[in-house]
Each structure stands twice: as C-alpha cells, then as structure tokens.
C-alpha cells in the first residue's frame, strides 16, 4: 500500500555554520511512500526499499529519493552508422540461378569479386565499412546491396554521414559510367550498365541527446538541458556548476523543484541573504544591503 506523508521542514547547515530552512518536498509535488512489511522506507518519487536503503529512480537521489540530481547520465553511442540501399547492374557476369543461392560457389565468387571492386571504389571514404549483397537477380546481374558507413559519435555526426553518402553516390555513379563493356570486352574487375545504378534508400542512426535528456528528466524535462564539453553531451539542470547554463546562487544553495531551479538563501550569524540569486545581503545589526 502507498501512504502519503506530511511535508517536513529540514534545517540545513552550510560550511559557514549557517542554517537554511527549506521544505524537503515541493508542496506542489504529490509524494508517495513505499512501505515494505514493517519497514516504512519513506522512498519517495517511485523509489523502492531494498532492505538497506532507498533505490531511487532517475532523476531522484537522497536518503528518501526526495532530491533531484543536478546532472543525468546520458550515453550517446560510441559510433553511429548509415546504411545505403543501392542497386547496380553488372554486365560482365552471366546470370545463373545458382547466384540466388548464397551458399553456392557462384554466389561466393561473385560476392568476393563485387566486394573487392566496391572496396576499391570507396577506398577514399573514411566512413566506409563495407558492402553486403542482399539480392541478385537477372538482368544481366542486378545487384541489390547495402553500403555500410560508420563514424565516431560527435554532435555533427549527421552532417558527416550525409556527406559520406553523397561521396558514395558520386563514386558509384563514376565507376558505373566508366567501367562499361566496349565491343563485348571488359578489362576491369567488373563492368556495369550505367543506367542500372540507383540509390533506393538511406537510413541514418537516429540519436538525439536532447530527447534522451528530456525523457530521463521526466517531469523536470523543461528544466534540464544539454550542453557539450569535449564533443560529449551532458544532461544538466541549472544547479550543476561549471556550465553556461549554471545558476549562480551566491550565498545560497541551488535546488530543483517542479517550477525549475531556485536558490535557497542562507542566514549567517551576521547576514540574511535574499533575492532570486541570494546576492542581496542584509547585515543583521545595521540592517543595510550589500550588493
């Protein structure tokens, strides 16, 4: 069963020995508590008691999963890829039904020759991984195949892969225009029918760090954002320090609520601090402001 617990007030002690009075739960947030057997674990926000402590769900942490993390781990793939579905017509090989059987000698030899030819054609493309024949059919030999491209993930990966697909198109067009049968002769490894070259489809890996960040931030999605450091995306709230979007709370502590990041100002022995960024200090004895 789930029970609703009352909101308590926590007094935080800063490094200066000052205190912060702050509600430990945002008033507007419905809080649920997980109760396991006799142990009321007080695991909030979907967290569960594992017998020792609360196991919190992203983006929460803390003894009772009551606090929101400042950053969320997002893991872009190490590499991203593109697959181009192409068709070319090879005129220098006679079609036989055996070519349809991928375990036949004919297919294996054709595959070897075609792969070697394509490796030569695309040798200047760093993203090129290889080709994979998907189907062979009559005409002389119509070769349906995939060209596989791969690159390291960077924020500009789509541009890199788009550029590589353009170069693939240029190179296959060039070779199938130049390596053609002349007087029933083909001196190249393979010859082609120029008109048989077609790009059927291009599929590029879809990875959006902003989308992953928003999904993991759940109800805080509007307040978490992605910033890059050394080409790596970081999913951060304004409470995470060291980023462009970081909120400076001066004499206070940054805390996330469902209304966004806010500063909880400290009270020292000598000053009260106030203002949105806790930058307005009021001296307790003289009652004047320091900006």
């Amino acid at each position: 069963p789930l029970a609703t617990i009352p909101v308590s007030t926590t007094s935080l002690t800063s490094s200066e020995g000052s205190t912060i009075s702050t509600p430990s739960v945002d008033i507007s947030t419905p809080v649920t508590t997980s109760i396991v057997g006799d142990q009321c674990s007080r695991c909030k926000n979907g967290g569960f008691w594992d017998g020792l402590k609360c196991q919190c769900l992203t983006p929460y942490y803390g003894e009772s999963c009551e606090e929101v993390v400042n950053s969320i781990d997002i893991a872009p793939p190490e590499t991203v890829s593109a697959q181009m579905e192409l068709t070319v017509t090879v005129t220098s090989v006679k079609f036989t039904d055996e070519l349809k059987n991928h375990s036949s000698q004919e297919f294996r030899e054709f595959n070897k020759t075609f792969t070697e030819q394509m490796n030569i054609v695309y040798s200047g493309i760093p993203e090129y991984v290889g080709v994979n024949i998907t189907n062979l059919r009559l005409g002389s030999v119509v070769v349906e195949h995939d060209v596989l491209l791969r690159t390291k993930y960077t924020p500009e990966y789509k541009t890199a892969l788009d550029n590589a697909t353009e170069v693939v198109k240029q190179k296959i067009t060039k070779v199938t225009t130049e390596q053609i049968m002349t007087n029933d002769n083909c001196s190249a490894l393979m010859c082609f029918n120029t008109t048989g070259t077609q790009v059927q489809n291009i599929t590029v890996t879809q990875y959006d760090p902003v989308e992953e960040c928003r999904q993991k931030a759940e109800e805080y999605e509007d307040y978490f954002l992605v910033e890059y450091r050394d080409q790596k995306p970081y999913c951060i709230s304004p409470c995470e320090s060291g980023f462009n979007a970081s909120k400076n709370c001066n004499h206070g502590k940054c805390q996330m609520s469902q209304n966004g990041a806010r500063c909880l100002c400290v009270t020292t022995e000598t000053h009260w601090y106030s203002g949105e960024d806790c930058n307005q200090g009021t001296q307790k004895s003289h009652h004047h402001h320091h900006h």
């Epitope: 220098s92 090989v93 006679k94 070697e116 029933d184 002769n185 083909c186 001196s187 190249a188 490894l189």
Partner: nanobody, 124 residues
Framework: DVQLQASGGGAVQAGGSLRLSCAAS???????MGWFRQAPGKEREGVAG???????IYADSVKGRFTISKDNAKNSLYLQMNSLAPEDTANYSC???????????????????RGQGTQVTVSS
C-alpha cells in the same frame, strides 16, 4: 577460393619447346583463363587468354608460337610454347576469373584468382 598451380617449366635451348600446365582446384568450364609472365626487373604481362566461350587471344610477342587451351574435364589450362627465345625467360603463372565471367577477350583483364608460377629459362 579457386587454387591454381602452374607446372612444366624448366631450362631449354633457344628454338626449343615446353608445355606448361595449370591445375585448378575447381570447375574451369565457365571461367575466363589466362597466362601471365614476369621477367626479373620487368612488369607482369599478359601472354595468352581464353574466354568463357573458348575465344583465344595472344600478346603480339608470342602470336604464332604459343597456343593456349583448356581441358574442362581435367580442370586444367595449358600453354604450348614453341620456338622459344631468350626473351621468353620469365616466371609463368596462370589466372582465372570468377564463374560465368563474360567479356574477357583482352589480355589486360583483371583476373581475381592467381596461381603460383613456374620458371622458364631459355638460353641461347
């Protein structure tokens, strides 16, 4: 892959004859086949070729002296060399296309399978 092994080379006097054989590990019926040679310090050159439909082609330097043939039943390729001259001294190797290759009626054709060679030495 198709394995090719040339044999029949040796030392011969100018004007003599030799018959080279090339044993293939698989069916050569529907393949273009060829003979190449490479002399020390020189580039490899095409000597003779036979297309999938039995049409033969020769380098100008060997025309009328060399004859290429194949025995499909034995999966073997041959090169009969007559009136040998010192300039024919080289390492001779055979080559094969993939199955059902067409349009290989020229010596510059790029074969995908190449065999081990056999040495031919012609002394004057």
């Amino acid at each position: 892959d198709v394995q090719l092994q040339a044999s029949g080379g040796g030392a011969v006097q100018a004007g003599g004859s030799l018959r080279l054989s090339c044993a293939a590990s698989g069916d050569i019926t529907r393949r273009c086949m060829g003979w190449f040679r490479q002399a020390p310090g020189k580039e490899r050159e095409g000597v003779a070729g036979i297309s999938e439909d039995g049409i033969t082609i020769y380098a100008d330097s060997v025309k009328g002296r060399f004859t290429i043939s194949k025995d499909n039943a034995k999966n073997s390729l041959y090169l009969q060399m007559n009136s040998l001259a010192p300039e024919d001294t080289a390492n001779y190797s055979c080559a094969a296309s993939i199955l059902n290759r067409v349009g290989c009626r020229q010596l510059s054709y790029e074969y995908i399978y190449r065999g081990q060679g056999t040495q031919v030495t012609v002394s004057s």
